[in-house]
Structures are given as C-alpha cells and as structure tokens.
C-alpha cells in the first residue's frame, strides 16, 4: 500500500491514497488514539452535575467539574474527539464539594488539536480519484480549570 | 514521494520513506504543530511560583497552577511535546491566591499521547535504507487540576 | 529585518541577582523559541536553557542548578533571563538567540542578540 | 551532556588555502549538528545547519559533512574576511552543546 504524496491539494503535501484503497483502518486508529479521553472513566459515571465528588474519575473530583463530549466525523483523521464540557459556571466549594464559589471562575483550556480532513484531490475525476489529507488546525477543550477571574487593568 | 506501509515493524502499519528521501518536512511539522503547548501566553508569563495570579494565561491563573516543561526528541513525530508540572501540591485559596488550602489537591491530568518513533525498518540494510514509524503511547501531563482528595471506602 | 536587542551591561556582587532583557522585533515572537548562551572569557559557548513564549514552555541546563529562570512577556515581545546566586564564574556576556527550526531536520539559532556583558566582582 | 571536541584548537593558513576543522561527538549524533562563526569582538552567526545545509547568505566556499560522532567544516578557498573562531553544537539532545572552537588565522 502506498500513500501518495499528492502535489493538488491546498495544504501540501498531503497523503493520497485511491478511493478504491483506503487508509488503512489501523493507520486511521493510531490517529484516532492519540485523541481519546485523557482521563479514563472509573467505577460509576456520575451523574453530570455541578458538584466535586470525593471519588472516581479525576473530571468529577475537580472542583470544576466536566464530561467529555464526543465529536465524530468519518472524514477526518482523528476521527473521534473529545471535548470537555464544563459543568459548572463557578469553582466549587471545597468545603462542601457541591455550593458553587463566586470567587472563582471554571474555565474550559482549550488547545488548537491538527487534524486530516479527506477532500478528493484537485483534478482527479472518475471512479478511481485519489482523496487527499487537508490538514486544519482544530479547537478543543481538554479540561476545566479553576482560576480567578481576570482583573483588568 | 511515496510513504509506503512497510509490514515488517513491528508496530504495523508504519510510513517507510527511504533516508535520502526524507519523510516530507511540511508533513511532519504538521504533527510537530498538533502538540503545541494548549495555552497561549498573553502578556508576562509569571515567574514559576505557587500562587494564582489574577491576570495572564490560564495556567497562571488556575488556583492549581502548573508551567510547561519542554520534552524534545528527534527520533519522534511529533518532536515537541509539552509536559504540565504543578506548582503547589494542594489548592491556592481563591480568597488570597497565595495560601494554599489543604482541602483541595493540585493533580497532574494525564493523558496517553500516539507519537511515532524514527526506527531502522526490520530486513533493510545499506546507505539508503529505509525507516519506521512506529507507533508508542506516551505519557503527558495536559494540566494541573484542583481536585477534593479521594476517600477511600 | 529581524533584530534581538539586549540590554546594558551590568556588574554585580557575589550572591546577588541579574536580570537581562532581550527585545525582539521584525517576526512574529510567538513563533519561535528563544535560547540563552553565555560567553566567559576565553571559553567555550554553554547553552544555558530556551522558552517558547507561546505559552512560557521551558527547558533549562540542569549544569546551572536551578539558578536560572526564563520567562517572556509576549506584549512587549522581550525575553528575560535571570540568573540568581552570581559567582565570579559567571562574568561573562550572555546572548539571547532565536531558534529556527524545520519541525523535523534542524533547530539551529539563527538570529542573536549583541550580548550583554555582566561582571560579577567583591 | 554530549561532549563536543574540535581540532585543531587554532590554526594558521594562507589566503586561497583549503582549510578543514574537525568536531567529534562522545556519542552518535546521527547529523543533528550545526556550525557558528564567531569574528573577533561579534557575536556568533550561523554558517551551517543539519551538518551540511549552509545557511542564508553564508558563502558557497563553505561546506560540511559527517554523519555520527565526526564532522567536518571545509572552507574550500580561504578568504582574509574568514578569520574568526568556528564553534560546532548539537541538537541531539538537551542541554545543547558546543566544541571548544577553533581559532582561525591567516599566515
């Protein structure tokens, strides 16, 4: 199997395999991987709602608590991301683990993840067209950050 | 230029250019860019010190503040990748961004990156040999989160 | 026209502290990593540690242990160096150096600032 | 940290002269090397990168080559504006390093 180098695209170079034979599913995988929720959900899932919990998964034990939400799209390689959702507007107590704090503010990090896009490739037509790899700069949340609100100045 | 799927690393399937022609520069600076530290820096960035600032990025301003350690490898796709270190062991207190409060712990985040390491391919010998991409979890800290310790049933 | 601009020179005593600037101007400071070597007289160049300001990312030689801090502030497009603890040892001229790279083949610094001359003397 | 030897540490020679400077690595560096010209009382420019790329502007008589733990800087034609020390580093692996420079005089 080759993946060539296809000199059309817009972004290049970009890899181009016919449409006849597709990336390979493993290849696609691997990308696919790299992108999987950070923090894998243990024991129960708890329910979505703003407060810290004292056990399971790292994202519900934060006081600025977030679920993962999935973004599919079978055209592009990472196929699944993930994008934290934060649960709550403000930090929550550490007292109680669940009154929300007006002096802190949860905040999602956000970070600009690359990611493939298959296009079919500028001036291939018919049956057998190559696709290419158009490559994007994507945004997604990775977590939920307690941080006190910005003073300006 | 052909990347070809090469079947005898043993992490299959793997990008094979040969040495004198290198894997495209652009291709790998694409997955170089997908790791670029999540945050970008507005305005100082404050020196290292356990204390939540109420201005500057995010990292900075996070009741559990981290900085970002470069970790460079040039056998690697991507080579930069960026490692969070928490600044305090438990929580800054959003009343004063400078005491620590013992009821919340400032945690690493972790999250098992796909990097790719530049390996000889298995059966191929002489000057223009051909090279692996072979595929690796690897493990980065994305941030630091202030979270209620764990009890223990 | 790219340009690193440092600032003046500087004699401290023993245990003090110094603090060099480096103000950068034509490209985009963001994008590119900046080291700091240092220059003793009739030695050789050491590479002291380099920050991306994109975000504040760090990577310092361990040899100076700890004594060293990088830090940038992106509005002012400068990157400072701190250096703590001074001893004799360390006079020399420091230079701030962009960092080209390829992403892939090379990293190599390609633009530097004039240096700034620090003279640690009792 | 990787240690980087260059010979000789000085060296005379006559204007048009083929000059060669050598740097040695402790360990394998694959070609992950560059090459810095230092002029006396100036502060240090790029002449070569990744072992044998020259640099923007850097003259054709400049040339290098290796692979490994040796490389070499060549100066096919020496000219009188060539006097300087020369200073290899590598990138393979933090912290970065630098030979102990070459001082480069015209007889």
């Known amino acids: 199997v080759s993946l060539r180098i296809q000199e059309g695209c817009s972004h290049l170079p970009s890899c181009c395999p016919s449409k006849e034979q597709e990336p390979p599913e493993e290849w696609l995988k691997w990308s696919s991987a790299s992108v999987s929720p950070p923090e894998p959900l243990s024991h129960t899932h708890h329910a979505e709602s703003c407060r810290a919990s004292k056990d399971g998964p790292l994202n519900s034990r934060a006081i600025s608590p977030w679920s993962y939400e999935l973004d599919r799209d079978l055209n592009r390689v990472p196929q699944d991301l993930y994008h934290a959702r934060c649960l709550c507007p403000h930090c929550v107590s550490l007292q109680t683990g669940s009154h929300m704090d007006p002096l802190g503010n949860s905040v999602p990090l956000y970070h600009n993840q690359t990611v493939f896009y298959r296009r079919p490739c500028h001036g291939e037509e018919g049956t057998h067209r190559r696709y290419c790899l158009e490559r994007r700069l994507y945004r997604v949340s990775l977590a939920c950050v307690c941080v006190r609100p910005r003073v300006m100045a | 230029v052909s990347l070809r799927i090469q079947e005898g690393c043993s992490h299959l399937p793997s990008c094979c250019p040969s040495k004198e022609q290198e894997p495209p520069e652009e291709w790998l600076k694409w997955s170089s860019a997908s790791v670029s530290p999540p945050e970008p820096l507005s305005h100082t960035h404050h020196a290292e010190s356990c204390r939540a600032s109420k201005d500057g990025p995010l990292n900075s301003r996070a009741i559990s503040p981290w900085s970002y350690e470069l970790d460079r490898d040039l056998n690697r796709v991507p080579q930069d990748l960026y490692h969070a270190r928490c600044l305090c062991p438990h929580c800054v207190s959003l009343q004063t961004g400078s005491h620590m409060d013992p009821l919340g712990n400032s945690v690493p985040l972790y999250h098992n990156q796909t990097v790719f390491y530049r390996r000889p391919c298995h059966g191929e010998e002489g000057t223009h040999r051909r090279y692996c991409l072979e595929r690796r979890l690897y493990r980065v800290s994305l941030a630091c989160v202030c979270v209620r310790p764990r009890v223990m049933a | 026209e790219v340009q690193l601009v440092e600032s003046g020179a500087e004699v401290k005593k023993p245990g003090a502290s110094v603090k060099v600037s480096c103000k950068a101007s034509?490209?985009?400071?963001?994008?590119?990593?900046m080291n700091w070597v240092r220059q003793a007289p009739g030695q050789r160049l050491e590479w002291m540690g380099l920050?991306?300001?994109?975000?504040?990312?760090?990577s310092y030689n361990q040899n100076f242990k700890g004594r060293v801090t990088l830090t940038v502030d992106t509005s002012a497009s400068t990157a400072y160096l701190e250096l703590n603890s001074l001893r004799s040892e360390d006079t020399g001229v420091y230079y701030c150096?962009?960092?080209?790279?390829?992403?892939?083949?090379?990293?190599?610094?390609?633009?530097w600032g004039q240096g700034t001359l620090v003279t640690v003397s009792s | 940290d990787i240690q980087m030897t260059q010979s000789p540490s000085s060296l005379s020679a006559s204007v048009g002269d083929r000059v060669t400077i050598t740097c040695s690595a402790s360990?394998?560096?694959?070609?992950?090397l560059n090459w810095y010209q230092q002029k006396p009382g100036k502060v240090p420019k790029l002449l070569i990168y990744y072992t044998s790329s020259l640099h923007s502007g850097v003259p054709s008589r400049f040339s290098g080559s290796g692979s490994g733990t040796d490389f070499t800087l060549t100066i096919s034609s020496l000219q009188p504006e060539d006097v300087a020390t020369y200073y290899c580093?590598?990138?393979?692996?933090?912290?970065?390093?630098f030979g102990q420079g070459t001082k480069l005089e015209i007889k």
């Open positions: 034509g490209y985009s400071f963001s994008g590119y990593t």
């Open positions: 580093q590598q990138y393979l692996a933090f912290p970065y390093t």
């Open positions: 920050i991306n300001p994109y975000n504040g990312g760090t």
């Open positions: 360990q394998g560096i694959s070609n992950y």
């Open positions: 150096a962009r960092e080209d790279y390829d992403g892939y083949l090379y990293f190599a610094m390609d633009y």
